[in-house]
């Protein structure tokens, strides 16, 4: 099995990931591994010579680039934060800051915007990936409530008065918790009619 550089008449190389076709000499040459770049191009008698990317630069893939890409920080003005640093083998890894979602995508997220508030009685539907889309608010399920306008507040279960040795004074709704009272306390006047029944 031929090792680069080797002649190729059909302009294709056996290992597309790690080799490339050099048209000037009609040969297949080695690409440089991630974290390196081409410091000397190949010829018929000599394979590609690779060198390590300098500090603050990277190449992510097997390549035949003559330079490394400059590391760039995540742009906080665009609502992005850093989750992993740039290394010679990968670019800086960014994501939307907490409370934001990706509003513009071009191979990666370029711009984040604030998540919409979910009104009382609802909560944001949980997504597989945080920051991927805006909130989709869904009603609290039975026996739960949520009493704020917030992008992140979750519906909480209604308080069970009996667990605290109390009795229910007013039932919970989707927007409010159960109101409990001491069993010895009289009911407020507006509710005494219901009690008599």
């Amino acid at each position: 099995q031929a090792v680069p550089p080797y002649a190729s008449e059909n302009q294709t190389c056996r290992d597309q990931e790690k080799e490339y076709y050099e048209p000037q000499h009609r040969i297949c040459c080695s690409r440089c591994p991630p974290g390196t770049y081409v410091s000397a191009k190949c010829s018929r008698i000599r394979d590609t010579v690779c060198a390590t990317c300098a500090e603050n630069s990277y190449n992510e893939h097997w390549n035949y680039l003559t330079i490394c890409q400059l590391c760039r920080p995540c742009d906080p003005v665009m609502g992005l934060e850093e989750i992993a640093p740039c290394t010679s083998k990968r670019k800086t890894q960014c994501r939307c800051q907490p409370g934001m979602f990706c509003a513009a995508w071009a191979l990666e997220c370029t711009h984040c915007e604030l998540l919409s508030d979910c009104p009382p009685g609802t909560e944001a539907e949980l997504k597989d990936e945080v920051g991927k889309g805006n909130n989709h608010c869904v009603p609290c399920k039975a026996g739960h409530f949520q009493n704020t306008s917030s992008p992140s507040a979750r519906c909480q279960p209604h308080t069970r008065c009996e667990n605290q040795g109390l009795v229910e004074a007013a039932p919970g709704t989707a927007q409010s918790d159960t109101t409990c009272k001491n069993p010895l306390e009289p009911l407020p006047p507006e509710m005494s009619g219901t009690m008599l029944m």
Partner: antibody, heavy 116, light 107 residues
Framework: QVQLVQSGAEVKKPGESVKVSCKAS????????LHWVRQAPGQGLEWMGW????????QYNEKFKGRVTITADKSTSTAYMELSSLRSEDTAVYYC?????????WGQGTTVTVSS | DIQMTQSPSSLSASVGDRVTITCKAS??????VAWYQQKPGKAPKLLIS???YRYSGVPSRFSGSGSGTDFTLTISSLQPEDFATYFC?????????FGQGTKVEIK
Amino acid sequence: QVQLVQSGAEVKKPGESVKVSCKASGYTFTTYYLHWVRQAPGQGLEWMGWIYPGNVHAQYNEKFKGRVTITADKSTSTAYMELSSLRSEDTAVYYCARSWEGFPYWGQGTTVTVSS
Amino acid sequence: DIQMTQSPSSLSASVGDRVTITCKASQNVGINVAWYQQKPGKAPKLLISSASYRYSGVPSRFSGSGSGTDFTLTISSLQPEDFATYFCQQYDTYPFTFGQGTKVEIK
């Protein structure tokens, strides 16, 4: 050559704040991240956060969020780390360090003692 | 946060010995691991980055290996100046985390 020179030792009382400086030279200050790492007596190393002087944006370890502020002055190529609401367990040597696949460059360290 | 568990916490060895220190990450960190040497009262010194690349000026007796979750620092023939504390560090994701250190003492 790259040099990071830190300010001198500090003695503080619980509840006070401390601000440590780190003056960089020998490279372009605005294009490299500067981190802060601390080491309590006889303990391991603990990463606190970083600043990218190019856009003066900082990011912190959640453990210190709200208590630590990292800033930078581009005109003097100096980074600062301020830690507030000090407690005795903040007694440590505080280092600034420039990163690239680890920390190849470190300041000499600043000892901060918190004692009543 | 990613935990870096280093072992042993201390070891006694003689000049000329081969010394191995291991570091285990709580999740996959690729090859994004560095090793440092620290002497009392001094800042740590970078020995190895990208798990196995010796930093410039570091003697060839120091070598690193591993990827994913298991990493090793080896000193092939311990020299008098190597008695120090060694730390591993992951720089794969924030927050960066360090191992608790291994103190190499004279037997």
